[in-house]
């Protein structure tokens, strides 16, 4: 028998690139059984998290999974960072693992690094 | 119960290139991490790199940087491991590895494809 | 890179009597989720490795309870508390905390 608990499946140390200037979509799936929980979107910044109060975000329903969506219309260099999501439920926090988004600068998209690169020279990333 | 199918044994050139092959049955490799792990004869173990399926990002240990790319096709539910350049060096078993990128609640290896470099 | 020196090399152990297995890591494996990524592997022979113990102590399915892990930081320790003829094999700690992953150089163990 399925768990009735909310969970959040977001992979551990899970990492996107994306090019600042496009649109973005960070999903954050959501399993429940009847109530959708209060699901928010937070911002890292040392070992705080830091609540995105501001920010447009929207849910997608599918058959067995729900997904809580992050907008980024469009990508800013200072998206670069990692975010996680949370559910309120039965007055429990339920907080998912991070997730890394590493933001090419437009200027520098002639010049991209690959997916491999920034993988492994994650410097590349900051200029 | 999830289960990984390699590729069989590869005797290829000095400088030549090798694709390997891993399928999964069991899970939706989507859901998972992907990874490559070297062992010469008689020697320990070595971590190449991984991959998420989901979105295709990879991570390497520098040492194979340029030597290995891993790739993956969510349609057939498989991860690839390219080698280029090949050496004696890279003589070795490749084993492929799966684990739930969630929890971690599986972790499952295949049985190891042989690579023989040869001339 | 994170560098696992495992201790002793090889192991001989009497059918019946205890063993243990100690795995030092050169920094902390304590994540900012607050898990520690520390696994132990045996690899018998002629096999592929097979995953023991995940998250310092968890047990895999179907891996017998006299086996048990312990430890946090950069200090743990795989005891099997009664040897049987088919634990023998090289058991591997390796830790999934930071990248690259890595590998401890193994253990083997003999049935004396």
């Known amino acids: 028998k399925e768990s009735c608990d909310v969970q959040l499946y977001i992979k551990r140390q899970s990492e996107h690139s994306i090019l600042a200037g496009d649109p973005f979509e960070l999903e954050c799936p959501v399993k429940y059984c009847a109530n959708r929980p209060h699901v928010t979107w937070c911002k890292l910044n040392g070992t705080t998290c830091v609540k995105l109060e501001d920010r447009q975000t929207s849910w997608k329903e599918e058959k067995n999974i729900s997904f809580f969506i992050l907008h980024f219309e469009p990508v800013l260099p200072n998206d670069n960072g990692s975010y996680r999501c949370s559910a309120n439920f039965q007055s429990n926090l339920i907080e998912s693992h991070s997730t890394t988004l590493y933001v090419t600068d437009v200027k520098s998209a002639s010049e991209r690094p690959s997916k491999d690169e920034m993988a492994s020279r994650p410097w590349l990333l900051y200029r | 119960e999830v289960q990984l199918q390699q590729s069989g044994a590869e005797l290829v050139k000095p400088g030549a290139s090798v694709k390997l092959s891993c399928t999964a049955s069991?899970?939706?490799?989507?859901?998972?991490?992907m990874y490559w792990v070297k062992q010469r004869p008689e020697q320990g173990l070595e971590w190449i790199g991984r991959?998420?399926?989901?979105?295709?990002?990879?991570r390497y240990d520098p040492k194979f940087q340029g030597k290995a790319t891993i790739t993956a096709d969510t349609s057939s539910n498989t991860a690839h491991l390219q080698l280029s350049s090949l050496t004696s060096e890279d003589a070795a078993v490749y084993y492929c590895?799966?684990?739930?990128?969630?929890?971690?609640?599986?972790?499952?290896w295949g049985a190891g494809t042989t690579v023989t470099v040869s001339s | 890179d994170v560098v696992m020196t495992q201790a002793p090399l090889t192991l001989s152990v009497t059918i019946g009597q205890p063993a243990s297995i100690s795995c030092k890591s050169s920094?902390?494996?304590?994540?900012?989720?607050?898990?520690?990524?520390l696994n132990w592997l045996l690899q018998r022979p002629g096999q592929s490795p097979k995953r023991l113990i995940y998250l310092v102590s968890k047990l895999d399915s179907g891996v017998p309870d006299r086996f048990t892990g312990s430890g946090s930081g950069t200090d743990f320790t795989l005891k099997i508390n009664r040897v049987e003829a088919e634990d023998l094999g090289v058991y591997y700690c390796w830790q999934g905390t930071l990248f690259p992953r890595t590998f401890g150089g193994g253990t083997k163990l003999e049935i004396k």
């Open positions: 069991g899970v939706n490799i989507k859901d998972t991490y």
């Open positions: 991959i998420d399926p989901a979105n295709g990002y990879t």
């Open positions: 920094q902390s494996l304590l994540d900012s989720d607050g898990k520690t990524y």
């Open positions: 590895a799966v684990y739930d990128g969630y929890y971690e609640s599986f972790d499952v």
